[in-house]
């Protein structure tokens, strides 16, 4: 899709397996033409996406794309769940696909569950 609309490049049904206690950066890649849009993160609670107000965020600029980053320093068990970024552009709200974080409690490295073990534990989201 090549246009001057704002585009948010989060893959549909993307997933991340992360460890509680570690730092993690959740990126929202943003493409825009002229003025950088106002971007926010929210966390899904059922069908409602609750805006994350008091969380550390930052921008990372690259040549053809910018990244609006949500920082987890450190990751906490209740960071489990699905997140979405949204951009305000010319009074339009553009929403990304949601991306899901599967958080596991701290274990020794040899005991860390694999990505597939994480994917098989949907109860971790609740």
């Amino acid at each position: 899709k090549e246009s001057c609309d704002v585009q948010l490049y989060i893959k549909r049904q993307s997933e991340h397996s992360i460890l509680a206690g570690d730092p993690f950066e959740l990126e929202c890649p943003v493409k825009y033409c002229a003025n950088r849009p106002h971007v926010t993160w929210c966390k899904l609670n059922g069908t409602t996406c609750v805006k994350l107000e008091d969380r550390q965020t930052s921008w990372k600029e690259e040549k053809n794309i910018s990244f609006f980053i949500l920082h987890f320093e450190p990751v906490l068990p209740n960071d489990n769940g699905s997140y979405r970024c949204s951009a305000n552009f010319q009074s339009n709200l553009i929403e990304s696909h949601s991306t899901t974080l599967y958080v596991t409690d701290v274990k020794s490295a040899s005991e860390r569950p694999s990505k597939d073990e994480m994917a098989s534990r949907p109860w971790l989201l609740y």
Epitope: K1, Y9, I10, K11, R12, S14, E15, H97
Partner: antibody, heavy 119, light 112 residues
């Protein structure tokens, strides 16, 4: 345009491991999902699993239990499938495919590789 | 797993005919984003499948306009408005809403 090229042995012994590679061109695989589907001779299509090459996160069809492993190498722009403990029932044409992870704007399949499981 | 059921399993038709293939899913394919991830594939003997339609009704690039898709929820349809000789093939529906992805059993379209 997006193209896929599969490679791997066409004959695998029972109880052995089937290994296939799928090289992509015309797209950066980190922007895609890559998946594997198989088709036994004269039968329908069966989804094996997929990978997000950007972070290595995989999803599998539970019917393959723990026998399937899908991996990706971003530097080589390719994905791989390993299927362990194969039997004659695993004889099939194996297809890799790739689709746009953001807008589903393309979905391209490889030419397929017939893998026969026989001693 | 979502079961995908196609009908008919096979179909004989003539060039110029209008043909309809149906696909029913065992549960709704409507995703949380309000879209149904239902695809149609065409497969010719000895060849790889090729996607014709995605998101129920969107035609892939280069697919002739005689192909169309419709439906919602659990019931979907592929229609070929005027069969051409190159359309004789096997057609599969498959869903991309939930894991694992699942396919219909296929509909073989043969020349009458």
């Amino acid at each position: 345009q997006v193209q896929l090229q599969e490679s791997g042995p066409g004959l695998v012994k029972p109880s052995g491991t089937l290994s296939l590679t799928c090289a992509a061109s015309g797209v950066n695989i980190k922007d895609t999902y890559m998946y594997w589907v198989r088709q036994p001779p004269g039968k329908g299509l069966e989804w094996i699993g997929r990978i997000d090459p950007a972070n290595g996160y995989t999803r599998y069809n539970p019917s393959f239990k723990s026998r399937a492993t899908i991996s990706a190498d971003k530097s080589k722009n390719q994905a791989s499938l390993k299927l362990s403990s194969v039997t004659a029932a695993d004889t099939a044409v194996y297809y890799c495919a790739v689709y746009d992870g953001y807008y589903e704007s393309f979905d391209v399949w490889g030419q397929g590789t017939l893998v026969t499981v026989s001693s | 797993d979502i079961q995908m059921t196609q009908s008919p399993s096979s179909l004989s038709a003539s060039v110029g005919d209008r043909v309809t293939i149906t696909c029913r899913s065992s549960q709704s394919l409507l995703d949380s984003d309000g879209k149904s991830y239902l695809n149609w594939l065409q497969q010719k003997p000895g060849k790889a499948p090729k996607r014709l339609i995605y998101l129920v009704s969107k035609l892939d690039s280069g697919v002739p306009s005689r192909f169309s898709g419709s439906g919602s929820g659990t019931d979907f349809t592929l229609t070929i408005s005027s069969l051409q000789p190159e359309d004789f093939a096997t057609y599969y529906c498959w869903q991309g809403t939930l894991f694992p992805r699942t396919f219909g059993q296929g509909t073989k379209l043969e020349i009458k």
